[in-house]
């Protein structure tokens, strides 16, 4: 799996999970989240060469098509596969509120 | 939706469905499929600018992050959303066999 266990341990130009820390205030302009101040969002990036972690039949076909037609622009792309929520604390006036924001953290990637 | 109805009607540089016909023999080197000779596989391509058809909370956050941090390389990518199967006819010896290959045709795209 193209997850932290594999990608953070290996120098990998191909599609892999990349570390990305987002500071809510500095990077998003969000002042409304009290805790955490930021989080490890991560992202997916890298080349999708022939059959590298192909996700669907279509992406495998596309991968093969590109090998035979190298001038083609129709190549798979490195995107998130597994995502996890992030629990945040914010205030509605003076009242603290805990909320789970879905699909905020990328855990693994795929070529799609 | 970034589907044929929208994308094939509009000239769109951003993430959209693109037409792609794949000839099994010529483009994939597959001689084993008897019918059809090829099919409209389509593919997804184009830029994913600020919140263009963002798929998940993470891709929206990433989109906002890129707007505020334009030097960042952590941008969403244009990939397939809805896929459909393709029915094929092939032969096992002299015996015709009909098979449905899942996820062979891209019907719409998203920024993920």
């Amino acid at each position: 799996a193209l997850d932290a266990a594999y990608c953070f341990r290996n120098v990998q130009d191909n599609c892999c999970l990349r570390p990305l820390y987002i500071d809510f205030k500095r990077d998003l302009g969000w002042k409304w989240i009290h805790e955490p101040k930021g989080y490890n969002a991560n992202f997916c990036a890298g080349a999708c060469p022939y059959l590298w972690s192909s996700d669907t039949q279509h992406s495998r076909v596309l991968s093969l098509y590109n090998t035979i037609n190298p001038e083609a622009s129709a190549s798979p792309c490195c995107v998130s596969q597994d995502l996890e929520p992030l629990t945040i604390l914010y205030y509605i006036g003076k009242t603290p509120k805990i909320e789970q924001l879905s699909n905020m953290i990328v855990k693994s990637c795929k070529c799609s | 939706a970034l589907d044929a109805a929208y994308c094939f009607r509009n000239v769109q540089d951003n993430c959209c469905l693109r037409p792609l016909y794949i000839d099994f023999k010529r483009d994939l080197g597959w001689k084993w499929i008897h019918e059809p000779k090829g099919y409209n596989a389509n593919f997804c391509a184009g830029a994913c600018p600020y919140l263009w058809s963002s798929d998940t909370q993470h891709s929206r956050v990433l989109s906002l992050y890129n707007t505020i941090n334009p030097e960042a390389s952590a941008s969403p990518c244009c990939v397939s959303q809805d896929l459909e199967p393709l029915t094929i006819l092939y032969y096992i010896g002299k015996t015709p066999k009909i098979e449905q290959l899942s996820n062979m045709i891209v019907k719409s795209c998203k920024c993920s």
């Epitope: 998003l28 302009g29 969000w30 002042k31 509605i92 003076k94 009242t95 924001l101 | 929206r60 906002l64």
Partner: antibody, heavy 120, light 107 residues
Amino acid sequence: DVQLVESGGDLVKPGGSLRLTCVASGYTFSSNVMHWVRQAPGKGLQWVAYVIPIVDIAYYADSVKGRFTISIDNSKNTLYLQMNSLKTEDTATYYCARTLGLVLDAMDYWGQGTLVTVSS
Amino acid sequence: DIVLTQPPSLSVNLGQTARITCRASQSLGSSYLAWYQQKPGQAPKLVTYGASSRAPGIPDRFSGTNSGITATLTISGARAEDEADYYCQQYADSPITFGQGTKLEIK
């Protein structure tokens, strides 16, 4: 320069529907919580609803809950207020406003307002 | 809901000090109140917020204080252009509420 421009106000019959639009420019739209506030003719200000961009957390005043829907198109820098089952007491000038940063906060920029008249 | 009570009107002489009060039905804390100025046919404009912060572009003759229950907007040396409706707003608790407004007349 920060600008908020509302549109969509009209004369509508009781029970009718209307959609208000607020287009923002001059700042990173998705960074600030957005509110709708209304003002009945000759009366004071009344808060209607808010939405947090990107995460789409919304909250409503009891008087409009179940009838009004606040929504946002982050990519178009646009805030909406879908108003259904309108009552005569909904007659007001509707303003969109952004907060300084927190969910409940002072509102540093307001639109010019759009007039909604509910009358038979 | 928190109720904010303001006097309906206030009249002061040109150049005098105007003090507009806003009384809350429960303690807000010092940082959860804002004041707005609204002129006829215009949108409200933020004047002060928080404990005593002035909004950008607001002249320093405007100042706000807040004890938790009673907030005061003070206009030192009132000018003709300060004639307007003034609203207090609390954001300590949901829902956000506004006072009924005070019409300030400059004589």
